[in-house]
Interface confidence: medium
């Protein structure tokens, strides 16, 4: 769960973030997993730790391996693992699959291609962009901040896009490249009767008394921008705001997410400090649009707690 795959090319900069997130003030210690040897924090080292970040300036093929990060909060040590692979530079133009970041889709209305992992680096604009190894030229292409905008997207714009930028560390410059595929989708929108993806109908959700619990109501309504679509939770047939239990709140801000081209909405129900009486309630996930309303019911059941919290036995 708290392991992350990272990769880079030899002689380029690679910066990896600890998969265990902590508050900015938390101390983070990095180790070579195999030897348990501490990674230095002094910036004069080629590989050094800097808080939540592990920096390879530049990376070497021999750096490949698993790195352990321990986020030290006042009481709890939370461990994460970064699985790092450094590859030799390819002589030809072809970018192998194992160097590709996640594919992004674009359409006539939305054609942003974000440069992967760039937020980890100290870079300055402009970015250089390449498609299938050719530098992008022409007024249709605009490098803006950390992304590329393509005007009047056509199906021929699909392909592999590489961003190249310079990372600066204490006055020294290091090159970084990252590649991802871009696909073009046809934006023909339509609306459907709501389909609730989660929770399942009559689902039983196990919760621990005294702990916090989250229930997610997730539904899809068709493709493209929807005129009217909403998801919400009800308790015993009553709106959350009218139910009057401050421990139980819906998370605001339903963001439309176009995954697989579908327009979907999420609403999270947060129950703080679960009590016995919460197990008696009926939780309804409602999804509605112009076609109508669909309802899935959830009930809570008690989960027997296992004492796995204490790190001191």
């Amino acid at each position: 769960k708290f392991s992350k795959q990272s990769w880079g090319l030899e002689n380029e900069a690679l910066i990896v973030r600890c998969p265990r997130q902590g508050k900015p003030s938390y101390t983070v210690d990095w180790y070579y997993s195999q030897t348990n040897k501490s990674i230095p924090t002094q910036e004069r080292n080629r590989v050094f730790a800097s808080g939540q970040l592990l920096k390879f300036l530049p990376a070497a093929v021999a750096d490949s391996g698993i790195y352990t990060c321990i986020v030290r909060s006042p009481t709890f040590n939370r461990t994460g693992y970064a699985n790092v692979t450094i590859y030799k530079k390819q002589s030809d133009c072809n970018v192998p699959d194992y160097l590709m970041y996640s594919t992004v889709s674009g359409s006539e209305k939305n054609s942003k291609i974000y440069c992967p992992t760039i937020d980890l680096y100290n870079w300055t604009a402009p970015l250089e962009w390449f498609k299938n190894c050719q530098a992008l030229q022409g007024s249709r292409y605009r490098a803006h901040k950390s992304f590329l905008v393509i005007d009047n997207v056509m199906t021929e714009d699909a392909g592999d896009y590489t961003c190249k930028f310079i990372h600066n560390e204490n006055g020294a410059n290091y090159s970084v490249t990252a590649t991802r595929s871009f696909t073009v989708k046809d934006e023909q929108g339509f609306s459907l009767f709501p389909v609730i993806g989660a929770p399942a109908q009559n689902e039983i959700k196990e919760v621990e008394i005294g702990k916090n619990a989250n229930l997610t109501c997730s539904a899809c309504f068709g493709k493209g921008t929807q005129f009217l679509a909403a998801v919400l939770w009800q308790l015993n047939g009553t709106k959350i705001t009218d139910f009057g239990e401050p421990r139980i709140q819906q998370e605001e801000g339903q963001n439309q997410s176009f995954s697989n081209g579908l327009a979907c909405l999420d609403m999270v129900l947060r129950i703080a400090d679960v009590k016995e009486e919460d197990l008696l309630l009926q939780y309804d996930c409602l999804a509605l649009n112009l076609h109508g309303l669909r309802r899935h019911t959830v009930r809570l059941s008690r989960k027997n707690p296992i004492d796995h919290h204490s790190i001191y036995c």
Partner: antibody, heavy 118, light 112 residues
Framework: QVQLQQSGAELVRPGASVTLSCKAS????????MQWVKQTPVHGLEWIGA????????AYNQKFKGKATLTADKSSSTAYMELSSLTSEDSAVYYC???????????WGQGTSLTVSS | DVVMTQTAFSNPVTLGTSASISCRSS???????????LYWYLQKPGQSPQLLIY???NLASGVPDRFSSSGSGTDFTLRISRVEAEDVGVYYC?????????FGSGTKLEIK
């Protein structure tokens, strides 16, 4: 200004249970882990355990496992400690204390005096 | 558990002069990250403890610079350069290297 306001003094019978509260103000509740400390003339300051309001994680001193249960209510920014099966050995002043990474036990409540007597 | 050892009383000091309070831990408090997890607290009469020093040598916010701390991984000293009447109380050292966190028994600062 971070403040921790603890509940008032308690006088309880042996064998009973009691819940002490600690209400935080002046900061974001989830930014601090809540530590609980016992103070007696004989044993001095003893760490009971800690609760992370952000994750719900708890850690206990083995000595107080089964005796103390730590919880919190984020909506009211209040941490709780329940002490069960009380004996005269549990008579003490109990402190809650907020900790950040560098500042362990940075802020302290005023303490709650617990007396267990028949 | 890590045992923190303190003497119960300091040598009585005159106001305006310096005072030293010592503390010893049963194991090194030096973490592999280079931080020494040793803390000092002062409990004034009738009050809750308050943080003075964190990570062996860092002054907590609002603490006068008359206070300083030094030490190795196991032996530590808290120094007060010019003792004032308000410094009276019990000084506790504590370790936060590993669970359970442990405190010293406290050293009472006495004025001549």
């Amino acid at each position: 200004q971070v403040q921790l306001q603890q509940s008032g003094a308690e006088l309880v019978r042996p064998g009973a249970s009691v819940t002490l509260s600690c209400k935080a103000s002046g900061h974001i509740f989830t930014d601090y882990e809540m530590q609980w400390v016992k103070q007696t003339p004989v044993h001095g300051l003893e760490w009971i355990g800690a609760f992370d309001p952000e994750t719900g994680d708890t850690a206990y001193n083995q000595k107080f496992k089964g005796k103390a249960t730590l919880t919190a209510d984020k909506s009211s920014s209040t941490a709780y400690m329940e002490l069960s099966s009380l004996t005269s050995e549990d008579s003490a002043v109990y402190y809650c204390s907020g900790s950040t990474t560098d500042y362990y036990f940075a802020y302290w409540g005023q303490g709650t005096s617990l007396t267990v007597s028949s | 558990d890590v045992v923190m050892t303190q003497t119960a009383f300091s040598n009585p000091v005159t106001l305006g002069t310096s005072a030293s309070i010592s503390c010893r831990s049963s194991k090194s408090l030096l973490h592999s990250n280079g931080i020494i997890y040793l803390y000092w607290y002062l409990q004034k009469p009738g009050q809750s403890p308050q943080l003075l020093i964190y990570q062996m040598s860092n002054l907590a916010s609002g603490v006068p610079d008359r206070f300083s701390s030094s030490g190795s991984g196991t032996d530590f000293t808290l120094r007060i350069s010019r003792v004032e009447a308000e410094d009276v109380g019990v000084y506790y050292c504590a370790q936060n290297l590993e669970l359970p966190f442990t405190f010293g028994s406290g050293t009472k600062l006495e004025i001549k």
